[in-house]
Amino acid sequence: KESCDVQLYIKRQSYHSIFAGDPFKLECPVKYCAHRPQVTWCKLNGTTCVKLEGRHTSWKQEKNLSFFILHFEPVLPSDNGSYRCSANFLSAIIESHSTTLYVTDVKSASERPSKDEMASRPWLLYS
């Protein structure tokens, strides 16, 4: 019998290499059974995750999964960092793994490096 616990499908140590000025959607895949939980995004500041208020978010529904989306319109250099989504379910908080956005400012890069280059060249990234 499949569990009816809420599950948040963000892979541990996942990352996205993105460019300042581009639009980007950060997705939190949510599995639930009956009632869709309340989901929020936060951004890690050291060990504290600061809730993101007043940001553009939306839901996308697919067959077996819903996606709670945080919109970046556009991506800013200050968006660099790690994010986590959390679901409020039966008065318990379920937290996802964090996922990291590596933001490259295209003004400081002569050409767009590949995703793998960006992940392995931290001097291109904002901290």
Epitope: Y9, K11, R12, Q13, S14, S17, H97, K115, A119
Partner: antibody, heavy 119, light 112 residues
Framework: EVQLVQSGAEVKKPGESLKISCKTS????????IHWVRQMPGKGLEWIGR????????KYSPSFQGQVTISADKSISTAYLQLSSLKASDTAMYYC????????????WGQGTLVTVSS | DIQMTQSPSSLSASVGDRVTITCRSS???????????LNWLQQKPGKAPKRLIY???KLDSGVPSRFSGSGSGTDFTLTISSLQPEDFATYYC?????????FGQGTKLEIK
């Protein structure tokens, strides 16, 4: 049934290149990380790197960076390890392993591919 | 890189014995989610490794309950409560908390 089936043993000459495949079945490859691990004759296990088949992101061990390329084609549930400019010291067994990326609920290993580099 | 040091490197034991293998990491394996990503693998001659234990103490499906894992921070233990003939193999610890991921050098468990 869960399976990771690797391509067959290879004998190569120094300087040549090689691409090993790892065909997965019985689970969704997009839910996993695919790892590649080397085992030289009579030695222990060495982590080469890891690929996220969902988006192509790859991490390499510094010991192998620039010597290998890891990739995956999620449409055919297959991962790849490319070895370039082969040397005799690349002679080893190479394993792929698929670990669930969310909660580590499974960790499956391929049967290995023996690569022999000899002139 | 994190060094994973297993002890002993080899071990002779008899069927029915209780066996303990230790693995020490050069820094804490505690991730920021509060979990330690420490696996134990078993490898028999000529075969691929097989995961036995993950997240320090969680047993993989189908792994006999005589295997158990424990520990935290930098010190971890694999225990086989009563050795069976099929348990004679090489055992590796593997950390996947910090990049690059690293293995212990292995502990070869032989029949006395």
């Amino acid at each position: 049934e869960v399976q990771l089936v690797q391509s067959g043993a290879e004998v190569k000459k120094p300087g040549e290149s090689l691409k090993i495949s790892c065909k997965t079945s019985g689970f969704n490859i997009k839910d996993t990380y695919i790892h590649w691990v080397r085992q030289m004759p009579g030695k222990g296990l060495e982590w080469i790197g890891r690929n996220d088949p969902a988006n192509g992101n790859t991490k390499y061990s510094p010991s192998f960076q620039g010597q290998v390329t890891i990739s995956a084609d999620k449409s055919i549930s297959t991962a790849y390890l490319q070895l370039s400019s082969l040397k005799a010291s690349d002679t080893a067994m190479y394993y792929c392993a698929s670990y669930e990326g969310y909660y580590e609920r499974f960790g499956y290993w391929g049967q290995g591919t023996l690569v022999t580099v000899s002139s | 890189d994190i060094q994973m040091t297993q002890s002993p490197s080899s071990l002779s034991a008899s069927v029915g014995d209780r066996v303990t293998i230790t693995c020490r990491s050069s820094q804490s394996l505690l991730d920021r989610d509060g979990k330690s990503y420490l696996n134990w693998l078993q490898q028999k001659p000529g075969k691929a490794p097989k995961r036995l234990i993950y997240l320090v103490s969680k047993l993989d499906s189908g792994v006999p309950s005589r295997f158990s894992g424990s520990g935290s921070g930098t010190d971890f233990t694999l225990t086989i409560s009563s050795l069976q003939p099929e348990d004679f193999a090489t055992y590796y610890c593997w950390q996947d908390t910090h990049f690059p991921y690293t293995f212990g050098q292995g502990t070869k468990l032989e029949i006395k």
